[in-house]
Amino acid sequence: KTLVLGKEGESAELPCESSQKKITVFTWKFSDQRKILGQHGKGVLIRGGSPSQFDRFDSKKGAWEKGSFPLIINKLKMEDSQTYICELENRKEEVELWVFKVTANSDTHLLQGQSLTLTLESPPGSSPSVQCRSPRGKNIQGGKTLSVSQLELQDSGTWTCTVLQNQKKVEFKIDIVVLAFQKASSIVYKKEGEQVEFSFPLAFTVEKLTGSGELWWQAERASSSKSWITFDLKNKEVSVKRVTQDPKLQMGKKLPLHLTLPQALPQYAGSGNLTLALEAKTGKLHQEVNLVVMRATQLQKNLTCEVWGPTSPKLMLSLKLENKEAKVSKREKAVWVLNPEAGMWQCLLSDSGQVLLESNIKVLPTWSTPVQP
């Protein structure tokens, strides 16, 4: 018995070959002996029932001369899964057709961290297994239902699912979009007084994007977090609903989501969490944003450099006179030099030698006051 696997909605070709490689009389039947179609010696295709009933069934006339009399079934349905009989040259050929479909149980647009369920739609009597490969090459295998929990950004793209039935295979492709921000977390390093730009680019593109969002901020100096801004998103247009008075944030009207803080101040240093709830989706997108603020000051005979905000313990804070070795260098959030010599001093925040933030302060001879360029 020949086995053919097909995909729902597509076409299948059921083979029937003559040993003589020439046109001959043939008939295709259902297993209950109802006639589907055939050729009775005049080279004309004759259908077994009403056109509406058999309009999905056809053969390849061009192949008849070569002794091939396939049954073509178009717009395959699950109910087409059965045994078909080809009668020719006083023999009967049985061809078993199984029709399958692989679908994403939920929407194909899923939030990062959510679960994806892939379902193999199969007819009664089938014994399939399915193996799906994610865009990042991860394989999952199972029966008729496969689940992937905690979707990641790299899971966005084309999933390839191979259905196996009696050693035969049929392949399905499903496009999955993982809705997420491009970065889970970002850090902005700023000198005191500088303007701060926060950007929240999305890792996906959709024609219409509607939802609402909010930025909650936990300042390092504050005991509790507070909502800095709430906004709506309608067809990729951003409109601010409510904004705190301190700081007075500004928000861009177009994507990517963009926030401007007029100036970096120590009291704003800390961590924020931007959440975006999308229309018709359960759950929210999250991006963490961190602000580190640096201040260099000279008070009487003390030159001080401080940073506020979430810094890693491996970051180095240094004070050095321009073109000279660092006078002081510590894995701390404040460093100082007593009785600094005159000249341009640099405060540097660095990570393994890479400067993340620097602030310059000019120390004048002791009879004058310091100048901050």
Epitope: T103, N105, T119, E121, G125, S127, P128, S129, T145
Partner: antibody
Framework: QVQLVESGGGLVKPGGSLRLSCAAS????????MNWIRQAPGKGLEWVSY????????FYTDSVKGRFTISRDNAKNSLFLQMNSLRAEDTAVYYC??????????????????WGKGTTVTVSS | EIVMTQSPAALSVSPGERATLSCRAS??????FAWYQQKPGQAPRLLIY???TRATGIPARFSGSGSGTEFTLTISSLQSEDFAVYYC?????????FGQGTKLEIK
């Protein structure tokens, strides 16, 4: 433990309607294909309907086509059978049953292993 | 549809003895075949699937054999709780079908 509990059976006049429910517990309902099977009094078993885990693939036996509708609500772990235009010959105990599978290497074996206790439907004038 | 024919319709066997139940399919069902046990007022209980694989929790005294069109259920040493009606079942072609049942009675 895995459990299927049918409800909604009762006495109905010919031509009437009934909606049977099957409440599933003890397993992830949305992962499984489900079935309705019936048994007429003192008679053998008859497979009524088959539904895929997503609810997108459905099959009925010829005697109920156009009259019965199988459906499921995965969020509520429930399977349903809406029975319209009921006939005397639909009188039976209706069971809901889960399709299970076991696998050996790449080969998967499917079978109907878990059944509910059944609910009785009587169609009589 | 595939017609399943069970024989005998009834079988009287003494406890401790061996019982052999047969089932014939009107066309090949490969090994997509199962045996069920049903006691009065209860739902059928799966004994054997894939023609010869014992379901979870089924004692080793139950064994299934055959493929294609001829199948056999053997109960090696009958216990009092084994007296019931046994149904064979094919799940190769839709509609799935059952045999008419074999009633296993105490002799």
């Amino acid at each position: 433990q895995v459990q299927l509990v049918e409800s909604g059976g009762g006495l109905v006049k010919p031509g009437g309607s009934l909606r049977l429910s099957c409440a599933a517990s003890g397993f992830t309902f949305s992962d499984y294909y489900m079935n309705w099977i019936r048994q007429a009094p003192g008679k053998g078993l008859e497979w009524v309907s088959y539904i895929s885990s997503s609810g997108k693939t459905i099959f009925y036996t010829d005697s109920v086509k156009g009259r019965f509708t199988i459906s499921r609500d995965n969020a509520k772990n429930s399977l349903f059978l809406q029975m319209n235009s009921l006939r005397a010959e639909d009188t039976a105990v209706y069971y809901c049953a889960r399709e299970d599978y076991s696998n050996y290497e790449d080969y998967y074996y499917y079978y109907t292993g878990v059944w509910g206790k059944g609910t009785t439907v009587t169609v009589s004038s | 549809e595939i017609v399943m024919t069970q024989s005998p319709a009834a079988l009287s066997v003494s406890p401790g003895e061996r019982a052999t139940l047969s089932c014939r399919a009107s066309q090949s069902v490969s090994s997509k075949f199962a045996w069920y046990q049903q006691k009065p007022g209860q739902a059928p209980r799966l004994l054997i699937y894939n023609a010869s694989t014992r379901a979870t929790g089924i004692p080793a005294r139950f064994s299934g054999s055959g493929s294609g069109t001829e199948f056999t259920l053997t109960i090696s040493s009958l216990q009092s709780e084994d007296f019931a009606v046994y149904y064979c079942h094919q799940y190769k072609n839709w509609p799935y079908t059952f045999g008419q049942g074999t009633k296993l009675e105490i002799k």
